[in-house]
C-alpha cells in the first residue's frame, strides 16, 4: 500500500524520493508522474530527470533538493485539493527490469483558516530556472531564465512552507530510498 | 509515414537460435520505446519483451528471459531480438510495435505494429 | 501476474447496432487499459488507451470507459469494417497481459 503524505491547500506539497548515485554524477533517469506506477515509465509525467539534468518539467512541480546527489523528492506548489492522489516515483536503474518504483499517495486537507490578504510570493519570479526537453519525444525547449542566487530569507520561509508535509528526515525513513552500486 | 518492418522469420529447429530485427523509419528511432509481442496462429497475443530509448533498460516476459535478448541499433534505427534454445512453443508470428509516446504520456501500449513475421519450431 | 478475461470470447452482429466488449482485470490496474483491433492476417491497431482515451484517427463511434478491474468497450452503429477480434492490455502490472479476444463476426 501507498505511503500517505499529507499538505493543506495553499501550501507546497512534498513528496519523498532518494537514491544513492553509485559515483557522484553518475545520475540515473527518475520520472515522477500523476497516477500509480505504470509497467514502463511513469503515467501522466509531471516531471523527468535524465543522466545530466531535469529535462521535463510541469508547473509548480519541481524537485527543491540536490537531484546530484539522488534527493528526487518532487515539491508541488501552491497544492488545491485537484492535487490529491497517487504519485509515483521511478527510479530508472539500468539493466533488466531493475526499475524502482515507488506509490506515493498524498491527501490534501482544506485550509485550517483563511488567511488575512497578503501578497503572494510568485515562485516562478523567486525561483526562474532553464529548462531544456531533449530527447524522449518531440524537441520543445522552455527557457524560464537561469537560476538566481537564494538567500537564507528564502530558505527559511521555504523551509517553513515544507514543515507541514512533512520533515525530510521522516520522509527518508519511509521506504522511498534506494541504493545504487 | 511510420513504418516499422520485421526481418524474414523461418522454419527452425529446436535448440537453435534466431535473430529477428525490426527496421524503423517514418519517426525518430531514439525518442520511443520498443516491444516485441508474439502471437500464436489462431490464439492471443503475448508480450515478449520492451526496450526503452537509449536500449540501458530491458523488461521481459519472466519465462524467456534467460532465452531472449531485445537490443537496439539507434544508428540504424534497428531493434533485435536474440532467441535461443528455441522450443516447438516459440512458434508464433513475431510482431514488433512501437511504445505510444508524447511528452507526459508513458510507453504502455503500442501505437504502430510491423507486419509480422512467422518463427515456426519444429523438427 | 494479472489476469485479464475478457467476454464474450465470440459475438455476431449486424451492421448498424450496437455492441459492448468487456474486460476484467484479476486485480486493480487503475485506468491503465488499452483496446486493440486485429483484423484477418493483419497486425493489431490501437485503438483506445488509459481506458477512455481514444486514439488518433479511431471513429467516434467507438467508446472506452471503465477503471479498477471492470472495462468496456462500446461500439455504435457497427460499420462493415468493425469486424475483426479486439483485445485488451493491462499495463500497470509486469508482465504486460493481454486478453483472450473476442472475435466480433457478421450476422
Known amino acids: 500500500s501507498e505511503v500517505e503524505y499529507r499538505a493543506e491547500v495553499g501550501q507546497n506539497a512534498y513528496l519523498p524520493c532518494f537514491y544513492t548515485p553509485a559515483a557522484p554524477g553518475n545520475l540515473v533517469p527518475v520520472c515522477w508522474g500523476k497516477g500509480a506506477c505504470p509497467v514502463f515509465e511513469c503515467g501522466n509525467v509531471v516531471l523527468r530527470t535524465d543522466e545530466r539534468d531535469v529535462n521535463y518539467w510541469t508547473s509548480r512541480y519541481w524537485l527543491n533538493g540536490d537531484f546530484r546527489k539522488g534527493d528526487v523528492s518532487l515539491t508541488i506548489e501552491n497544492v488545491t485539493l485537484a492535487d490529491s492522489g497517487i504519485y509515483c516515483c521511478r527510479i530508472q536503474i539500468p539493466g533488466i527490469m531493475n526499475d524502482e518504483k515507488f506509490n506515493l499517495k498524498l491527501v490534501i486537507k482544506p485550509a485550517k483558516v483563511t488567511p488575512a490578504p497578503t501578497r503572494q510570493r510568485d515562485f516562478t519570479a523567486a525561483f526562474p530556472r532553464m529548462l531544456t526537453t531533449r530527447g524522449h519525444g518531440p524537441a520543445e525547449t522552455q527557457t524560464l531564465g537561469s537560476l538566481p542566487d537564494i538567500n537564507l530569507t528564502q530558505i527559511s520561509t521555504l523551509a517553513n512552507e515544507l514543515r507541514d508535509s512533512r520533515l525530510a528526515n521522516d520522509l527518508r525513513d519511509s521506504g522511498a530510498t534506494i541504493r545504487i552500486g | 509515414e511510420v513504418k516499422l518492418v520485421e526481418s524474414e522469420g523461418g522454419l527452425v529447429q529446436p535448440g537453435s537460435s534466431m535473430k529477428l530485427s525490426c527496421t524503423a523509419s517514418?519517426?525518430?528511432?531514439?525518442?520511443?520505446?520498443m516491444t516485441w509481442v508474439r502471437q500464436v496462429p489462431e490464439k492471443g497475443l503475448e508480450w515478449v519483451a520492451s526496450?526503452?530509448?537509449?536500449?540501458?533498460?530491458?523488461y521481459y516476459l519472466d519465462s524467456l528471459k534467460s532465452r531472449f535478448i531485445i537490443s537496439r541499433d539507434n544508428a540504424k534505427n534497428i531493434l533485435y531480438l536474440q532467441m535461443s534454445s528455441l522450443k516447438s512453443e516459440d512458434t508464433a508470428t513475431y510482431y514488433c510495435?512501437?511504445?505510444?509516446?508524447?511528452?507526459?504520456?508513458?510507453?504502455?501500449?503500442?501505437?504502430?505494429w510491423g507486419q509480422g513475421t512467422t518463427l515456426t519450431v519444429s523438427s | 501476474d494479472i489476469q485479464m478475461t475478457q467476454s464474450p470470447a465470440s459475438l455476431s452482429a449486424s451492421v448498424g447496432e450496437t455492441v459492448t466488449i468487456t474486460c476484467r482485470a484479476s486485480?486493480?490496474?487503475?485506468?491503465?487499459l488499452t483496446w486493440y483491433q486485429q483484423k484477418q492476417g493483419k497486425s493489431p491497431q490501437l485503438l483506445v488507451y488509459?481506458?477512455?482515451t481514444l486514439a488518433e484517427g479511431v471513429p467516434s463511434r467507438f467508446s472506452g470507459s471503465g477503471s479498477g478491474t471492470q472495462f468496456s468497450l462500446r461500439i455504435n452503429s457497427l460499420q462493415p469494417e468493425d469486424f475483426g477480434n479486439y483485445y485488451c492490455?493491462?499495463?500497470?502490472?509486469?508482465?504486460?497481459?493481454f486478453g483472450a479476444g473476442t472475435k466480433l463476426e457478421l450476422k
Open positions: 488509459n481506458a477512455k
Open positions: 517514418g519517426f525518430t528511432f531514439s525518442d520511443y520505446y
Open positions: 492490455q493491462q499495463h500497470y502490472g509486469t508482465p504486460l497481459t
Open positions: 510495435a512501437r511504445g505510444y509516446y508524447y511528452y507526459g504520456s508513458s510507453p504502455n501500449y503500442f501505437d504502430y
Open positions: 486485480e486493480n490496474i487503475y485506468s491503465y
Open positions: 526496450i526503452n530509448y537509449d536500449g540501458r533498460n530491458t
